[in-house]
């Protein structure tokens, strides 16, 4: 059974992940056209189901394309370079989902824009945090 300290650690990690994802989304929303227009033509894969920490596997698999898209934007809207930002997210995701169990991610048929993708994972974080508090 999870201890109160491990629950607290999970909550803090999720909050950190949530802030990172929100920072990316805010940065994207500050883009001028045609950068945003171009960005929105990139498609991301969405999880069929995202209700447990193990489902973060689906986010992990999309971090490389996410980094590429952020690199293309060459934005000054982020305090960190995309590589560092995504690296930070990757570390948190790996810790949260754990490496003991191998989970095969199932993706939805429909792809999503970067904005829809980020909003989906922001909602996921908020949902899990609410169950922990």
């Amino acid at each position: 059974a999870p201890t109160s300290s491990s629950t607290k650690k999970t909550q803090l990690q999720l909050e950190h992940l949530l802030l990172d994802l929100q920072m990316i989304l805010n940065g994207i929303n500050n883009y001028k056209n045609p950068k945003l227009t171009r960005m929105l033509t990139f498609k991301f894969y969405m999880p069929k189901k995202a209700t447990e920490l193990k489902h973060l596997q689906c986010l992990e698999e999309e971090l490389k394309p996410l980094e590429e898209v952020l690199n293309l934007a060459q934005s000054k809207n982020f305090h960190l370079r995309p590589r560092d930002l995504i690296s930070n997210i990757n570390v948190i995701v790996l810790e949260l989902k754990g490496s003991e169990t191998t989970f095969m991610c199932e993706y939805a048929d429909e792809t999503a824009t970067i904005v829809e993708f980020l909003n989906r994972w922001i909602t996921f974080c908020q949902s899990i945090i609410s169950t922990l508090t």
């Epitope: 045609p34 950068k35 227009t37 171009r38 033509t41 498609k43 293309l72």
Partner: antibody, heavy 121, light 108 residues
Framework: QVQLVESGGGLVKPGRSLRLSCAAS????????MSWVRQAPGKGLEWVAM????????YYTDSVSGRFTISRDNSKTTLFLQMDSLRTEDTAVYYC??????????????WGQGTLVTVSS | DIQMTQSPSSLSASIGDRVTIPCQAS??????LSWYQQKPGKAPKPLIF???DLETGVPSRFSGSGSGTDFALTISSLRPDDFATYYC??????????FGHGTKLEIK
């Protein structure tokens, strides 16, 4: 790093066919629109064809429409250009190029080294 | 299709000169314009996109300006490596992308 390597060029007679390939590496190929751009000897650049990230949309310049077909195999990270009913005016170096977008509204940010297609009897 | 006019077709300049290469679109293309540098026997190299944004790794002596129909590529202080042919390219009239015919920058 991003690499685009073209192959399949050569000498071909008018009316014949040729298939160009472009092996892509160093990026998530299945997220990017790809194009072919050509350059006739001593001439300028001409965009030939473009394909969206998933192959769902293809676009062509008028002079090749109906004769050329652009396609991609995302599992093999390879772009193709099937060229049928070739004409002497199709003689050019053909470049495989990446666009920093999933579809349209995009310039070309990475270019292959090119492959020469010569159409002559 | 939108026509891209690059005039002159060739330009002579000396090392250290400030050079401006113009490009004109036949209709408004907003800032959907890019610039490429090409050397003989080589693939074009991207320099500028969205009219004024510098590609990663391109020296800051290169700059792009303009919007609508009139654009320019400026090299603030010519280096020996800059002698090449420069092409402008519009990606506004999707999907009918068109290039200018190029301006060859030669040593005076």
């Amino acid at each position: 790093q991003v690499q685009l390597v073209e192959s399949g060029g050569g000498l071909v007679k008018p009316g014949r066919s040729l298939r160009l390939s472009c092996a892509a590496s160093g990026f998530t190929f299945n997220r990017y629109a790809m194009s072919w751009v050509r350059q006739a000897p001593g001439k300028g650049l001409e965009w030939v064809a473009m394909i969206s990230f998933d192959g769902g949309n293809q676009y062509y310049t008028d002079s090749v429409s109906g004769r050329f077909t652009i396609s991609r195999d995302n599992s093999k990270t390879t772009l193709f250009l099937q060229m049928d009913s070739l004409r002497t005016e199709d003689t050019a170096v053909y470049y495989c190029v990446r666009s920093p977008a999933g579809d349209w509204v995009a310039y070309f940010d990475y270019w292959g080294q090119g492959t020469l297609v010569t159409v002559s009897s | 299709d939108i026509q891209m006019t690059q005039s002159p077709s060739s330009l002579s300049a000396s090392i250290g000169d400030r050079v401006t290469i113009p490009c004109q679109a036949s209709e408004d293309i907003s800032n959907h314009l890019s610039w490429y540098q090409q050397k003989p026997g080589k693939a074009p190299k991207p320099l500028i996109f969205d009219a004024s944004d510098l590609e990663t790794g391109v020296p800051s002596r290169f700059s792009g300006s303009g919007s609508g129909t009139d654009f320019a590529l400026t090299i603030s202080s010519l280096r020996p490596d800059d002698f090449a042919t420069y092409y402008c390219h519009q990606y506004h009239d999707y999907p009918s992308y068109t290039f200018g015919h190029g301006t060859k920058l030669e040593i005076k």
